[in-house]
């Protein structure tokens, strides 16, 4: 058993049929010595008396809010949550496996630049009685500070018969050094509580590996005289790190016909302009990637050829 | 060439070669889902590689003030990785074909380090740890870790030379 926060405790249980469970001793936070009784949740049934209460925790029916009273007055509470371990593996019932980039990916994170700011998100099908708390650091043995905000519900989607809820959190490294080569990964820890079930999820990454620039901005076409060619120009996204002579991007320019089956023409360039042939009913798209490190491409910025 | 103690490197040449290094490092070990290398026993493997750290003067301001600190750090790293890529970590099994990008990577690391340091002058170099794993799986794991680490190192070096070529070239 360990303390998650004041008056909230997590009991770690090996979860299998007829498991013996864990013996837990609760102590009433009071100077009083006698006349103390214990109840669980809203029930008025007295579970025991005395300053301490010993219970055998085996299942969710044994978890909940234990309250000690004296003469009708509440003295203190202890909330017991359960953390299940099945076949040596902690349960992951609350969050959905996003399966990208690999199986057992529950948390996904992205950064728009090298400033040390990043966003993580996760998915669940649970809509109520759900709380999250997020902590982060750089490195684990001698951790350096990363400050995370509160997790918020950022999107709701309907997937078949189910509703899916996306939560996200923003974090910022306290003393970020954008130009340095990271040697210690960022660690992100999410505590998830659904009713009386506790689970924790972790992710470990370097900012460089989760970089995904915003799409290029101000995408414009300039027809070239007496030609089917156009000059496409664009700018670095505002959110990208500066100076651009140091934090450079490379670009992919694509000409795509109306039909998905039509052959796509692609050009790669380090410049912020390119000359391409604009076909009727086609569109021109440009996306960006860090020039020197193969992290994710941005989403496409597009304009119609006409 | 970067004569230590003062004169500028051939920024544009260094920029071109460092960008080629980035491409080669990713060809040698593309991002594929075969292993999360940080989970696969991080013990004594690549902890000793030289990293370009915050105080090494490789940021735009540091380069403007005095690029020599940063160039020395980059040179140190290039020599270190060049020795690693020439070691039995990369020559043993699993066998690399002669067309492997590792061979070109090895040569290009040497080329860039020579651009930064002419013959006759020696910056101190970091000792290369004696890593000679006997099993193919240990060797392959080390290879992957070294190449992932090299990708990060050459990315910073390439930024330095790109910025230098754009703003510090005579």
């Amino acid at each position: 058993i360990w303390e998650l926060k004041k008056d909230v405790y997590v009991v770690e249980l090996d979860w299998y049929p007829d498991a013996p469970g864990e013996m837990v001793v609760l102590t009433c936070d009071t100077p009083e010595e006698d006349g103390i009784t214990w109840t669980l949740d809203q029930s008025s049934e007295v579970l025991g008396s005395g300053k301490t209460l010993t219970i055998q925790v085996k299942e969710f029916g044994d978890a909940g809010q234990y309250t000690c009273h004296k003469g009708g007055e509440v003295l203190s509470h202890s909330l017991l949550l359960l953390h299940k371990k099945e076949d040596g593996i902690w349960s992951t019932d609350i969050l959905k496996d996003q399966k990208e980039p690999k199986n057992k990916t529950f948390l996904r994170c992205e950064a728009k630049n090298y400033s040390g700011r990043f966003t993580c998100w996760w998915l669940t099908t649970i809509s109520t009685d759900l709380t999250f708390s997020v902590k982060s650091s750089r490195g684990s043995s001698d951790p350096q500070g990363v400050t995370c905000g509160a997790a918020t519900l950022s999107a709701e989607r309907v997937r078949g018969d189910n509703k899916e809820y996306e939560y996200s959190v923003e974090c910022q490294e306290d003393s970020a050094c954008p130009a340095a080569e990271e040697s210690l990964p960022i660690e992100v820890m999410v505590d998830a509580v659904h009713k009386l079930k506790y689970e924790n999820y972790t992710s470990s990454f370097f900012i460089r590996d989760i970089i995904k620039p915003d799409p290029p901005k101000n995408l414009q076409l300039k027809p070239l005289k007496n030609s089917r060619q156009v000059e496409v120009s664009w700018e670095y996204p505002d959110t990208w790190s500066t100076p651009h002579s140091y934090f450079s991007l490379t670009f992919c320019v694509q000409v795509q016909g109306k039909s998905k089956r039509e052959k796509k023409d692609r050009v790669f360039t380090d410049k912020t302009s390119a000359t391409v042939i604009c076909r009727k009913n086609a569109s021109i798209s440009v996306r960006a990637q860090d020039r020197y490190y193969s992290s994710s491409w941005s989403e496409w910025a597009s304009v119609p050829c006409s | 060439r970067a004569v230590p103690g003062g004169s500028s490197p051939a920024w544009t040449q260094c920029q071109q070669l460092s960008q080629k290094l980035c491409t080669l490092a990713w060809s040698a070990h593309p991002l594929v889902g075969h292993m999360d290398l940080r989970e696969e026993g991080d013990e004594e493997t690549t902890n000793d590689v030289p990293h370009i750290q915050c105080g090494d003067g490789c940021d735009p301001q540091g380069l403007r003030d005095n690029s020599q600190f940063c160039l020395q750090r980059i040179h140190q790293g290039l020599i270190f990785y060049e020795k690693l890529l020439g070691s039995d970590i990369f020559t043993g099994e699993p066998s690399l074909l002669p067309d492997s990008p590792v061979g070109q990577l090895h040569a290009s690391l040497l080329g860039l380090s020579q651009l930064l340091q002419p013959e006759g002058h020696h910056w101190e170099t970091q000792q290369i740890p004696s890593l000679s794993p006997s099993q193919p799986w240990q060797r392959l794991l080390l290879r992957f870790k070294i190449l992932r680490s090299l990708q990060a190192f050459v990315a910073v070096a390439a930024r330095v030379f790109a910025h230098g070529a754009a703003t510090l070239s005579p």
Epitope: - | P30, P94, S100, V102, W137
Partner: antibody
């Protein structure tokens, strides 16, 4: 796109020789090794060896040394595999293939195969 | 030479079945193992490399696992178009060697 086109089927007498060609296109010929494999009827694959056209250096499976000569002609982007002293057990489909760009020998592109039949 | 012992040599399964083919290397090959599919009269087609990395365009029902000496190719839900021979291949050590193949048929 990368293509490897092999020469047509051959029927040979025991003791004679055969030279199979593999014309490459869609990539820099000198930049990658070209490998040869064979597959006897109803059998698995056997790796014979490779040539690296950049420096014309071949490497052979010891089991085929003296039996096989692998060469390359840079001017026509063609690799050749010559089998000498043919015996009936050399009857097989012979494939040329090129590996992944990362320098490890898993084979992405294959020629269509050339059936060599050795029969008196 | 490294021997790649592949089993079974043939197997028959129903559409939708989970199918497993194994390969045992005679010594440590790390994860330097590829799997190929060869349909009758066709050339081998790469499915998996580095023991578990799916090649571009290969359906997700194909997966590979294993390291050092023991390797597995799994088809999670057999489809009619999966009828073929399957070969494992070690590229750790010269001479590169292949398993003897598994002929997969539909019941």
């Amino acid at each position: 796109q990368v293509q490897l086109v092999q020469s047509g089927a051959e029927v040979k007498k025991p003791g004679s020789s055969v030279k199979v060609s593999c014309k490459a296109s869609g990539y820099t010929f000198t930049g990658q090794t070209i490998h040869w494999m064979r597959q006897a009827p109803g059998q698995g694959l056997e790796w014979i060896g490779y040539i690296y056209p950049r420096d014309d250096s071949p490497k052979y499976n010891e089991n085929f040394k003296g039996k096989v000569t692998i060469t390359a002609d840079k001017s026509t982007s063609t690799a050749y595999m010559e089998l000498s002293s043919l015996r009936s057990e050399d009857t097989a489909v012979y494939y040329c293939a090129i590996p992944d760009r990362s320098g490890y020998a898993w084979f992405i592109y294959w020629g269509q195969g050339t059936l060599v039949t050795v029969s008196s | 030479d490294i021997q790649m012992t592949q089993s079974p040599s043939s197997l028959s399964a129903s559409v939708g079945d989970r199918v497993t083919i194994t390969c045992k290397a005679s010594r440590d090959v790390a994860i330097a193992v590829a799997w190929y599919q060869q349909k009758p009269g066709k050339v081998p087609k790469l499915l998996i490399y580095w023991a578990s990395t799916r090649h571009t365009g290969v359906p997700s029902r194909f997966s590979g696992s294993g390291s050092r000496t023991d390797f597995t190719l799994t088809i999670s839900s057999l489809q009619p178009e999966d009828v073929a021979d399957y070969f494992c291949h070690q590229y750790s050590s010269y001479p590169f060697t292949f398993g003897s193949g598994t002929k997969l048929e539909i019941k």
